[in-house]
Amino acid sequence: KFSKQSWGLENEALIVRCPRQGKPSYTVDWYYSQTNKSIPTQERNRVFASGQLLKFLPAAVADSGIYTCIVRSPTFNRTGYANVTIYKKQSDCNVPDYLMYSTVSGSEKNSKIYCPTIDLYNWTAPLEWFKNCQALQGSRYRAHKSFLVIDNVMTEDAGDYTCKFIHNENGANYSVTATRSFTVKDEQGFSLFPVIGAPAQNEIKEVEIGKNANLTCSACFGKGTQFLAAVLWQLNGTKITDFGEPRIQQEEGQNQSFSNGLACLDMVLRIADVKEEDLLLQYDCLALNLHGLRRHTVRLSRKNPIDHHS
């Protein structure tokens, strides 16, 4: 709980925000968890704390580890953990999966690609953008504020996009790069009221206590590109991100598939180390688009670890 993964490349700037949000201006103390050593606040240090931010200027592979932040007040201290991994720079063009931020989808009408994490940095426009390691050139590409706009998007525009910018700290400049995949959606088609293919309404899913369990929410919304379509899981009517149980997570990103020409999305709910209290929760698969929302409810039941065969 209150833990966040952050990653960066050696010799680049990396800025991490304390996962335990307070309000601005509160005192935040940072520690290197393995040694419980306090992170200095003096900016002359390569790694230093600045309020809710932990700054690596620049980062080194040896900086990898878990950092503890404590938002302090006289009556209520709040602790968070930043799991930081610094990787060596790749010699080739390929960006490995572990360096990729979440995938974004675009269409002819909407083709913004936001540069991940950029809001944490002190940067000035323009951003540099690369696709599959090639600098983007031509009038179709416009770097605007913290995002890239592609005019007249085509299927060929799908790929890995890297933004590169300079972070400035007290007159010193540090390079930062961040990469995410971009997929292109077909514009032609139609939209329907969502149809949930799985799970069935009021389905009972058998799980084993102590084991992992997966629930898949799958729904179709029409044919071709859908302007607004989403599937998600809720626990007791609350979004997974707000529910605050780290053992229960939605799979990052939604998979779009085309079944018999239909545009379908699925979202996998992963429950690690199933506990008794998980059986008491109501799991709702929600599918929504411009036509409305459909909900299928699932409950978990205990499955005996040993199956008895006659």
């Epitope: 309000k23 201006s25 005192t27 302090r72 007040s73 006289p74 009556t75 209520f76 529910f243």
Partner: antibody, heavy 117, light 111 residues
Framework: QVQLQESGPGLVKPSQTLSLTCTVS?????????WNWIRQPPGKGLEWIGY???????TYNPSLKSRVTISVDTSKNQFSLKLSSVTAADTAVYYC??????????WGQGTLVTVSS | DIVLTQSPASLAVSPGQRATITCRAS??????????MHWYQQKPGQPPKLLIY???NLESGVPARFSGSGSGTDFTLTINPVEANDTANYYC?????????FGQGTKVEIK
């Protein structure tokens, strides 16, 4: 958007127990923060009753501690106030509110509880 | 318990003028470089609304006409310039220790 809504009987008899519930939407109360009860007698100022934090740990105002219990129902995303042995002096508008650290940034609309026979 | 005393109990201000409310604590509410004093606005029939936290920090979405200052035991909420819809009760609250306490309130009326 975080929203809080108080509910419970508007009239309680003296010596009985006042019971109120605060239903939270837009945020899971077990995710983080502290969840407070505050009251305001008609035409008077505010009095902090106590809070329960995301982990279920409670802190009460010593002036009411012997009569107060704050608890949480995670399945309904609600937290509750019980105030025993009430008297007319407990007549007030009761508010629930969220504390990020120690100021209260989201409040319910409040519910008036009258103690009368 | 820390007792918070607000003054004046009420004041009437013309639109465009400055309104100043003070809050005095029975002991210091400052420690470790911060002052744990907060200000709320309460309009009739509504719950309080957080205006200022940590003595001088403007809560998100609150107009910059509101400002707070002070440290130790003496704190001030200033509204400048006052507008017609600022008619309300204003409360200070400390969080230096348990229990949290509020001031008795100051009623601001617009002439």
């Amino acid at each position: 958007q975080v929203q809080l809504q108080e509910s419970g009987p508007g009239l309680v008899k003296p010596s009985q127990t006042l019971s109120l519930t605060c239903t939270v939407s837009g945020y899971s109360i077990t995710s983080d923060y502290a969840w407070n009860w505050i009251r305001q007698p008609p035409g008077k100022g505010l009095e902090w009753i106590g809070y329960i934090d995301y982990s279920g740990s409670t802190t009460y105002n010593p002036s009411l501690k012997s009569r107060v219990t704050i608890s949480v129902d995670t399945s309904k995303n609600q937290f509750s106030l019980k105030l025993s042995s009430v008297t007319a002096a407990d007549t007030a508008v009761y508010y629930c509110a969220r504390t990020v650290i120690d100021s209260m940034d989201y409040w319910g609309q409040g519910t008036l509880v009258t103690v009368s026979s | 318990d820390i007792v918070l005393t607000q003054s004046p109990a009420s004041l009437a201000v013309s639109p465009g003028q400055r309104a100043t409310i003070t809050c005095r604590a029975s002991k210091s509410v400052s420690t470790s470089g911060h002052s744990y004093m907060h200000w709320y606005q309460q309009k009739p029939g509504q719950p309080p609304k957080l205006l200022i936290y940590l003595a001088s920090n403007l809560e998100s979405g609150v107009p910059a006409r509101f400002s707070g200052s002070g440290s130790g035991t003496d704190f001030t909420l200033t509204i400048n310039p006052v507008e017609a819809n600022d008619t309300a009760n204003y409360y200070c609250q400390h969080s230096r220790e348990f229990p949290f306490t509020f001031g008795q309130g100051t009623k601001v009326e617009i002439k």
